[in-house]
Interface confidence: low
């Protein structure tokens, strides 16, 4: 029988009446156009909704937008369009919401063609009030907040000027011209690339990378011959042109660009690209595109300096620059990532790693599923997950995989069971242990979301017909109840819940269509009365993450430590609550060779944990570039994996000697840098 339909599924008592009392409809006095929704702050209940409607006239496009505000998680909305003087807001810039709980919002208005500059509306009180400000430039990008100080904003103008405000957009100053890309770093630092000759496109590969640490009073050129740059964790990366035949290399800095090292990664040609897939303060996952239009490349994982890289995964699916990759960080369990590979026969297969890219394996076949037509052997196959690539290919996949840091171990995704991803209609699968084991959760494609830190999962069937039914589960997707939230079905457009999965409210968005008109409508359902009591100690059970062999003393050890979590029992129907904090007990493991990556000049033969010297390098000096100097490496082949906390056990030693020689290949050496002041 289908999941949730067997007799042992206990029904939540009187849920229809409880939910009916907590279902709030809001019909928006709008013609249907587009709608965008933003949460302002964390746990504030404030939602802003911007509806936009374009009327194409013969000569020009007339636009109209309305702004609505809720302060009760979407149960009620108030039209606050008058606060922005009924101005048409440009949806391509979205609503720029300030970091943390600053309460700041910036909306960018549409202005008439001949105006000197753009116009913004600013609020610093969670959109209760707005101030109109005329800009001395036309913005090209959305206003970007400094992560450290929400009063500091930067924006690029349509004329490629870099503009900065120190008083939350009240006053603006152009600090540099001819700017292609600008990003905030840490400590209110701004990094940006500039062009010297024609344009950003014409100078690609000849750009300069600049830094200002004082909002434009002084500058330092920290790189030349730049193609692009990126920030990830504590790493600053620059893609640097290597020579006249248009290859480029990645350089990395961990001191905001003062010193650079050439990353030990392959160079790429004109048609190839690098992509930072994920980064934290310990390490980075880097994708390096294959030459030719292959649609795949190689994933490399870095050491703690971002310099030495280990090959992590071959034939990694990544279509083109800025294209599609299925790479997904499973945030509900440390060290877990899921992605897709393009196999030799051009089929797409899902791979998972539980140890931050050390080893990749296929996903275990769900026990309650059969292998599909793609499987050669009907008894042996794997689960394959649909993610960004499937969505881009217009497969019947409404949502990417979902996990939440505070819903420990839970991963929800569309998938198919066979030898490769199938183009057939997918089902929804759930894992409650971070991806080690999977169960079919729902037949057919659905939208889904996690509420109350995993206490409730909500789903809506993906259908082209109007819908009026929502499904919910209080036991991590084992059993499902259905609730009819309206008599009049709506054309469903999206599920919205507060980011962070702590809320117990879900908003169902859609539109109604009558003979003459269509209107936006939202239904907000509060599940607080379904989970009527607060969870107590007895509702939680101890769970050892990454456990695969309970008999083994080292069971659960990943990256040098194991973690025991307190997890809600599936049978407990109670509220984790908004203040729920994941309780975990870490314990350090003994070091083994698995806790070390292979150092520069070494590699791991397949199915072997030992790092062996590349045969042709035996007896030769190992030299590599570090901070623009040549280093001599004395090593026995191992370097501790970034973030690995193991102690004792195996302890290979390594030593690096400074050869005090310049690396002529390091295009970002200090002597090529200069400073200047405004």
């Amino acid at each position: 029988s289908a999941p949730g339909e067997d007799e042992e599924c206990g029904r939540v008592r009187d849920f229809v009446a409880k939910l009916a009392n907590n279902t709030h409809q809001h019909v928006f006095d709008d013609l249907r156009g587009s709608v965008s929704l933003s949460w302002v702050g964390d746990s504030t209940g404030v939602i802003l909704v911007l509806t936009t409607f374009h009327v194409p006239l013969v000569i020009m496009t007339f636009g109209q937008s309305k702004l609505y505000r809720s302060e009760d998680y979407g149960k009620n909305f108030k039209d606050i369009t008058d606060l922005i003087n009924n101005t048409f807001i440009r949806t391509e810039f979205g609503m720029a919401i300030g970091p943390e709980n600053s309460g700041k919002v910036v909306l960018t208005a549409e202005v008439s063609g001949g105006s000197r500059g753009g116009r913004i509306f600013r609020s610093s009180d969670f959109a209760k009030n707005f101030v109109q400000t005329d800009l001395p430039f036309h913005p090209l990008t959305q206003m970007m907040y400094s992560p450290q100080n929400s009063d500091y904003l930067l924006a690029l103008s349509t004329e490629n000027g870099l503009w900065v405000s120190k008083n939350f957009g009240g006053k603006w100053e152009e600090i540099h011209k001819a700017v292609c890309l600008a990003k905030w770093g840490s400590d209110n630092t701004i990094f940006f690339t500039t062009y010297a000759n024609g344009s950003c496109k014409a100078d690609l590969g000849a750009l300069e990378l600049w830094r200002t640490s004082d909002l434009g009073k002084s500058f330092k050129t920290i790189g030349v011959k730049i193609y692009s740059f990126g920030l990830g964790g504590r790493f600053l990366f620059a893609s640097v042109m290597a020579d006249k035949d248009t290859t480029r290399r990645i350089h990395v800095s961990t001191d905001q660009g003062d010193t650079w090292s050439m990353a030990q990664l392959p160079s790429v040609g004109q048609e190839q690209f690098y992509s930072i897939l994920a980064a934290n303060d310990d390490m980075v996952f880097m994708h390096v595109d294959e030459p030719g239009d292959t649609g795949f490349g190689t994933i490399f994982t870095s050491d703690d300096r971002g310099i030495v890289y280990s090959k992590s995964l071959d034939r990694h699916l990544y279509t083109t620059t800025g294209g599609e990759t299925d790479f997904t960080n499973v945030t509900s369990l440390r060290g877990v990532y899921i992605t897709s590979v393009l196999s030799e026969d051009n089929s797409i297969q899902t791979m998972i790693t539980f140890d931050q890219g050390g080893r990749w394996t296929h996903l275990r076949k769900p026990e309650n599923s059969e292998c599909d037509a793609t499987a050669k052997n009907k008894n042996e196959c794997s689960l394959h997950i649909h993610a960004s690539y499937s969505i881009s290919q217009k497969l019947n996949v409404p949502m990417a995989p979902l996990s939440e840091p505070n819903a420990v171990g839970i991963v929800i995704a569309h998938g198919s069971v066979g030898d490769a991803i199938s183009v057939m209609v997918p089902d929804v699968y759930i894992s409650d242990d971070g991806g080690y084991s999977w169960t079919k959760m729902l037949e057919g494609p659905h939208y889904y979301t996690i509420l109350d830190s995993g206490g409730i999962i909500v789903a809506i069937e993906h259908s082209s017909r109007p819908i009026n039914v929502i499904k919910f589960s209080t036991d991590e997707g084992q059993c499902w109840q259905t609730y009819t939230f309206t008599r009049d079905p709506i054309y469903f457009t999206g599920l919205a819940s507060e980011p962070g999965a702590r809320s117990m409210n879900i908003s169902i968005w859609g539109f109604t269509e009558s003979f003459l008109t269509s209107q936006w409508v939202s239904y907000t359902i509060d599940f607080k009365d379904i989970l009527e009591r607060n969870c107590e100690e007895k509702d939680y059970t101890i769970w050892l993450a990454h456990s695969t062999d309970p008999e083994d003393y080292e069971d659960g050890c990943i990256l040098g430590y194991k973690e025991q979590f307190l997890r809600l029992r599936k049978s407990s129907v109670c509220q984790n609550g908004r203040d729920y904090v994941v309780t975990k007990q870490p314990s350090i493991c003994l070091c083994s060779l698995e806790d070390f990556l292979c150092d520069f000049g070494y590699y791991r033969p397949e199915n072997d944990s030992k790092c062996v010297e590349q045969p042709e390098l035996k007896g030769h000096d190992l030299e590599f570039c570090l901070y623009g100097r040549e280093e001599h490496l004395t090593t026995n082949g191992y370097r501790k994996i970034p973030g690995d906390k193991c102690q004792g056990g195996v302890n290979p030693v390594r030593e690096v000697k400074d050869l005090k020689k310049k690396c002529t290949s390091n295009f970002l050496s200090p002597e090529k840098q200069n400073s200047k002041s405004n």
């Epitope: 290597a242 020579d243 006249k244 035949d245 290859t247 290399r249 030990q264 990664l265 392959p266 160079s267 390096v288 294959e290 030459p291 030719g292 292959t294 490349g297 190689t298 490399f300 890289y309 090959k311 071959d314 520069f600 000049g601 590699y603 590349q614 045969p615 042709e616 390098l617 030769h620 000096d621 190992l622 030299e623 590599f624 570039c625 040549e630 020689k661 690396c663 002529t664 290949s665």
Partner: antibody, heavy 129, light 107 residues
Framework: QVQLVQSGAEVKKPGASVKVSCKAS????????MSWVRQAPGQGLEWMGI????????SYAQKFQGRVTMTRDTSTSTVYMELSSLRSEDTAVYYC??????????????????????WGQGTTVTVSS | EIVMTQSPATLSVSPGERATLSCRAS??????LAWYQQKPGQAPRLLIY???TRATGIPARFSGSGSGTEFTLTISSLQSEDFAVYYC?????????FGGGTKVEIK
């Protein structure tokens, strides 16, 4: 344009040494490795070794270990291949070739191989008593 | 070391015909394989890299395929300038090794 220009033909006696140069132009010398390949008369191609112009680190085929030395001069964008203890079977055309191999080449390659895309014109070395 | 074996040693083909050259590796070289063309008295010229990607300026009649241990170079319609010796070369594990070559001659 990208070019590798090699030194002229050499005639050597058995037991002597020969040093062949290869001057690179048209690209950033330090951005690519350089391989040396030889071809005996009427025979196929034989890879001898590779040098990283950055640090000068080298990797040689086992067959030539102890007899071959590859060096580079970054100021003149030139690589050198010296073969000692010459024997008659070392009579061959010696080529330098730009090689975009992996980081610590040639180990397990970390991507599809680009191939040796630019070759010198070849230097004929004749070993005869 | 990885041994590369090319077959046939000689291939006699008429102009305009299709030529198929094989290269086998003694162990998997993944896609780390290149094909070269060499004419008498000239240096080799790169045709194909990454097993299947044509190098810059190489006509579309040349195509490479294969992965792992079996590789093929196909010349769809031989032109007079295509009669030469063709070598495959692996770069999966050092030392780099070449196949013995296939001579394509006029029939």
């Amino acid at each position: 344009q990208v070019q590798l220009v090699q030194s002229g033909a050499e005639v050597k006696k058995p037991g002597a040494s020969v040093k062949v140069s290869c001057k690179a132009s048209g690209y950033t010398f330090t951005s690519r490795y350089m391989s040396w390949v030889r071809q005996a008369p009427g025979q196929g191609l034989e890879w001898m070794g590779i040098i990283n112009p950055v640090g000068g680190s080298t990797s040689y085929a086992q067959k030539f270990q102890g007899r071959v030395t590859m060096t580079r001069d970054t100021s003149t964008s030139t690589v050198y291949m010296e073969l000692s203890s010459l024997r008659s079977e070392d009579t061959a055309v010696y080529y330098c070739a730009r090689d975009p191999s992996g980081i610590a080449a040639p180990g397990p390659a970390s991507r599809g191989y680009y191939g040796m895309d630019v070759w010198g014109q070849g230097t004929t070395v004749t070993v005869s008593s | 070391e990885i041994v590369m074996t090319q077959s046939p040693a000689t291939l006699s083909v008429s102009p305009g015909e299709r030529a198929t050259l094989s290269c086998r590796a003694s162990q998997s070289v993944s896609s780390n394989l290149a094909w070269y063309q060499q004419k008498p008295g000239q240096a080799p010229r790169l045709l194909i890299y990454g097993a299947s990607t044509r190098a810059t300026g190489i006509p579309a009649r040349f195509s490479g395929s294969g992965s792992g241990t079996e590789f093929t170079l196909t010349i769809s319609s031989l032109q007079s300038e295509d009669f030469a010796v063709y070598y495959c070369q692996q770069a999966r594990l050092g030392p780099w090794t070449f196949g013995g070559g296939t001579k394509v001659e006029i029939k």
